[in-house]
Interface confidence: low
Amino acid sequence: SGVFQLQLQEFINERGVLASGRPCEPGCRTFFRVCLKHFQAVVSPGPCTFGTVSTPVLGTNSFAVRDDSSGGGRNPLQLPFNFTWPGTFSLIIEAWHAPGDDLRPEALPPDALISKIAIQGSLAVGQNWLLDEQTSTLTRLRYSYRVICSDNYYGDNCSRLCKKRNDHFGHYVCQPDGNLSCLPGWTGEYCQQPICLSGCHEQNGYCSKPAECLCRPGWQGRLCNECIPHNGCRHGTCSTPWQCTCDEGWGGLFCDQDLNYCTHHSPCKNGATCSNSGQRSYTCTCRPGYTGVDCELELSECDSNPCRNGGSCKDQEDGYHCLCPPGYYGLHCEHSTLSCADSPCFNGGSCRERNQGANYACECPPNFTGSNCEKKVDRCTSNPCANGGQCLNRGPSRMCRCRPGFTGTYCELHVSDCARNPCAHGGTCHDLENGLMCTCPAGFSGRRCEVRTSIDACASSPCFNRATCYTDLSTDTFVCNCPYGFVGSRCEFPVGLPPSFPW
């Protein structure tokens, strides 16, 4: 099922005459009859097998036809059909003159015909209008036409019936070819099968509407991929429904018997090691300094006499402390103190005893420092070099490596950047704090006046009489190309008329 649409656009009958050549009085009040029929190699009279339609009077002699309803008629004209579009057709368009208001064929004189056109060909279903223009000796008709499918009909021949729906029998819209296009969330031949929540377990879950995941017995979770253990399972899991597989450290039918008291209750104190020894039983192995079933009691750490070499032990909140006799040091008074006899001074330092030999002091040679003369003196630590100079240690002395533009022992003297005459082509050099600047003469540019800038000698429009000006870049001068009839370096002089020739 579909509609053949004909859009009349313009009719030209400049002389206002009928097909017979006789003029209309007072003008040709024109209406149209349209006949649509099956394809004929030669279009001949006979039944309009695909339909017929007439218009009201649309205008007089020559006129354009509006795209909307006009005088009760419609434009485009509609020729509906309720069969498969065959892809070919014949079309007859007759223009008639209406002397009065009665447009019925039997009410018109036979010579009221203004023009008649007949075309035939192939025409595919589609939205695009096909434009045509038919001209006779007296008239011209411009029109366009197309075939479109009726609502709910699709395909190349408008033969596929498809009506969109969203109910128990299907959830779809129709594609241009009439095939079903499922609404989001539906699938299947007639789009009746919902698409479950993404990831919903294929066997353990199902859905009755899109994006849903309903669990079958024994399964739970958003995607129905978690089994349900049997009722009362305390510390266990399942791999299939109604199981109770115990977690580590638990036992019994309901996994409620504690086999790992150490892990679940941490009974041992003060860093002791816990060992399981049966259901709800354990043993604590205490760290030194602690005792009791749970190692909760603290022993005095001085009981083990930790201080050596006659040191005396004092208990403290976080342990103990040894008070060492003279000549000993260390956590347990295990080390004896140094004296000059132990040669403690490095790099040629000399040792001096103090406090009757109980301790000593080192006197260091030049370039070394530290309590044992172990450190070399760095003469660059004071940053003596100015203006970003780099300090270098050179044996007992130091030197400064200066940045460009500076000199002197400590890079304190500024060298003039202009001393090298860096500006080309007579440019003037200016010393600046961070370098130099060149002021360039006319015709030159760049940081060092190294770029030759061409002067546009044509800028002042030196050529007369519409001559074309060219700049000579090598000499910065101009050349004028004179039009016919003028000479001179600026084309300023008119040439005299050429002499007349004797022939």
């Epitope: 795209d67 060909g121 192939s122 695009n128 209008w129 434009l131």
Partner: nanobody, 125 residues
Framework: EVQLVESGGGLVQAGGSLRLSCVAS????????MGWFRQAPGKEREFVSS????????NYTDSVKGRFTISKDNAKNMVYLQMNSLKPEDTAVYYC??????????????????WGQGTQVTVSS
């Protein structure tokens, strides 16, 4: 023949806008209508929108109605596609197309179709 060159594609975030342009050259006096098609990876080329060169109206596919607007400039032989409220599913190569009228033959009318090279539109989420 009509030559078509598209421009204006690019990368844009979802909800953003792009304006595609297509310039026609060659036998432009024969153009009947112009429009846009698109082709996403692994999918067939699909119609997006068209505009009648003589000013007789526009067409849009349902998924872009209210978001895309097609327009033309006959003097410049240009057609434009203003794309607003872009979605990730609008990601595709967009092709300009022109139908040229239309030759009458003994078997009916024949319509010619010309394609551009395409411009990539990518909408990120």
């Amino acid at each position: 023949e009509v030559q078509l060159v598209e421009s204006g594609g690019g990368l844009v975030q979802a909800g953003g806008s792009l304006r595609l342009s297509c310039v026609a050259s060659g036998d432009t006096s024969e153009i009947y209508d112009m429009g846009w098609f698109r082709q996403a990876p692994g999918k067939e080329r699909e119609f997006v929108s068209s505009i009648h060169w003589g000013g007789r109206g526009t067409n849009y596919t349902d998924s872009v109605k209210g978001r895309f607007t097609i327009s033309k400039d006959n003097a410049k032989n240009m057609v434009y596609l203003q794309m607003n409220s872009l979605k990730p599913e609008d990601t595709a190569v967009y092709y300009c197309a022109a139908t040229r009228l239309i030759v009458y033959t003994p078997t009916g009318f024949r319509q010619y179709f010309d394609w551009g090279q395409g411009t990539q539109v990518t909408v990120s989420s």
